[in-house]
C-alpha cells in the first residue's frame, strides 16, 4: 500500500513539475528591466526564451519573437536546449510511469517489469528536473553577469555614440516557476525510484519438498516455505532427512502411487 502511495505521489508531483517546466519555458518574463528613468514614458521591458516584450505606462504592449538563431547569445541557446531536453525527458517519463503505476493493470505485466519501468521513469524525472534547474540557473547567471557588465559599457559607433542603458535587470517570474518546477520533478523522480525498490519482487526460493512416508500415508507439502532471506538453516535446499524426503529437484522421474505432488 505504501509503495502504491509513494509511486502515485511521485507521479503526481512529477506531473505538476513537468507542467511547471513547460509553463516556465513558454513564459515571457524570464528577465525584466524597469526603465523608470525613461524621459518619454515609463517603459517595462521583459524577455523570454522566445520573444521580447515592451509595456508602456499607457497600456501599450508589444511582443516580438527572436526570428533568428545566429544573432542570439550562446547562453540563451543553451538554456533553450536544456529546457526542451527537460520537457522531452519529462514527457517520456510520464508516459512510461503511467504504464508502471501499480494501480493500473495492463495485460499480464509482471511486478518486475513495473519496477523497471518505475525506475526508468524516476531516472528520467530526475534528469528532467536537473535540466530545468540548470537551464534556469544558467539564465539567472547570464542576467547577473549582464548587470555588472552594463554598468560601464559605452562605445562610439559610426553614427555617434552607443551606450548600454542603466537598467535594473531583475529575475522574472519564469525563473522562480522554473526553479520550483525543476525541484518538484526532481522530488517526484526520487519518489519513483524509492517506489521501485518496494515494487521489485524479492528473489524467492519456493522449492516444494515432498515427503515420502514409508507407510501408506499421503504425501504432503508443509505450508510454511522458506524464502531466501538468509534466515533458517535450510537456505540451500539440502535434504532435511534421509528418510525419503527429497527436494523437487531430486524427485525421481517415475511416478509413485503415493506421489500427489
Amino acid at each position: 500500500m505504501a509503495v502504491t502511495a509513494c509511486q502515485g505521489l511521485g507521479f503526481v508531483v512529477s506531473l505538476i513539475g513537468i507542467a511547471g517546466i513547460i509553463a516556465a519555458t513558454c513564459m515571457d518574463q524570464w528577465s525584466t528591466q524597469d526603465l523608470y528613468n525613461n524621459p518619454v514614458t515609463a517603459v517595462f521591458n521583459y524577455q523570454g526564451l522566445w520573444r521580447s516584450c515592451v509595456r508602456e505606462s499607457s497600456g501599450f504592449t508589444e511582443c516580438r519573437g527572436y526570428f533568428t538563431l545566429l544573432g542570439l547569445p550562446a547562453m540563451l541557446q543553451a538554456v533553450r536546449a536544456l529546457m526542451i531536453v527537460g520537457i522531452v525527458l519529462g514527457a517520456i517519463g510520464l508516459l512510461v510511469s503511467i504504464f508502471a503505476l501499480k494501480c493500473i493493470r495492463i495485460g499480464s505485466m509482471e511486478d518486475s517489469a513495473k519496477a523497471n519501468m518505475t525506475l526508468t521513469s524516476g531516472i528520467m524525472f530526475i534528469v528532467s528536473g536537473l535540466c530545468a534547474i540548470a537551464g534556469v540557473s544558467v539564465f539567472a547567471n547570464m542576467l547577473v553577469t549582464n548587470f555588472w557588465m552594463s554598468t560601464a559599457n559605452m562605445y562610439t559607433g559610426m553614427g555617434g555614440m552607443v551606450q548600454t542603458v542603466q537598467t535594473r535587470y531583475t529575475f522574472g517570474a519564469a525563473l522562480f516557476v522554473g526553479w520550483v518546477a525543476g525541484g518538484l520533478t526532481l522530488i517526484g523522480g526520487v519518489m519513483m525510484c524509492i517506489a521501485c525498490r518496494g515494487l521489485a519482487p524479492e528473489e524467492t526460493n519456493y522449492k516444494a519438498v515432498s515427503y515420502h512416508a514409508s507407510g501408506h500415508s499421503v504425501a504432503y507439502k508443509p505450508g510454511g516455505f522458506k524464502a531466501s532471506t538468509g534466515f533458517g538453516s535450510n537456505t540451500k535446499n539440502k535434504k532435511i532427512y534421509d528418510g525419503g524426503a527429497r527436494t523437487e529437484d531430486e524427485v525421481q522421474s517415475y511416478p509413485s502411487k503415493h506421489d500427489y505432488v
Epitope: V40, E56, N146
Partner: nanobody, 121 residues
C-alpha cells in the same frame, strides 16, 4: 550594431519651419523610445521631444504647440516638425533611440552625431 542618422537641419529665418528626420539602421530588433535632444553652445543638452513605440509623446515646455514629433515604427524613423522657429531654437539637434538588443540581451541607447539648426534673420 544600431546607428541613427539625423537630417533636415539648416539655416532658417525666425517664424519659419523645418522638418528633421532621424533614421535608425543596422541590426535592429525593436526600438522602444526615440527622442530629439538639443544642445546650444555653452549650454547643457536638453530633451526637446520624445515618442514611445506606442505613440506616447512628451515635449519640453518651451516648444509645446510649436513642435510636433512623430514616428514610423515600420521604417524605424522619427520626425520633428518645427514651426514658428525662434532664435533661441538655434542649437545642434541630436537623435536618441533606446533599443532592445537580443544579441547582447541588453538595452542600448544610441545617439546620432547631430544636425545643426540655425534660426537667424
Amino acid at each position: 550594431e544600431v546607428q541613427v542618422q539625423e537630417s533636415g537641419g539648416g539655416l532658417v529665418q525666425p517664424g519659419g519651419s523645418l522638418r528633421l528626420s532621424c533614421a535608425a539602421s543596422g541590426n535592429i530588433f525593436r526600438i522602444d523610445t526615440m527622442g530629439w535632444y538639443r544642445q546650444a553652445p555653452g549650454k547643457q543638452r536638453e530633451l526637446v521631444a520624445g515618442i514611445s513605440r506606442g505613440g506616447t509623446t512628451t515635449y519640453a515646455h518651451s516648444v509645446k504647440e510649436r513642435f510636433t514629433i512623430s514616428r514610423d515604427n515600420a521604417k524605424n524613423t522619427m520626425y520633428l516638425q518645427m514651426n514658428s522657429l525662434k532664435s533661441e531654437d538655434t542649437a545642434g539637434y541630436y537623435c536618441n533611440a533606446q533599443a532592445w538588443d537580443p544579441g547582447t540581451f541588453r538595452y542600448l541607447e544610441v545617439w546620432g552625431q547631430g544636425t545643426l539648426v540655425t534660426v537667424s534673420a
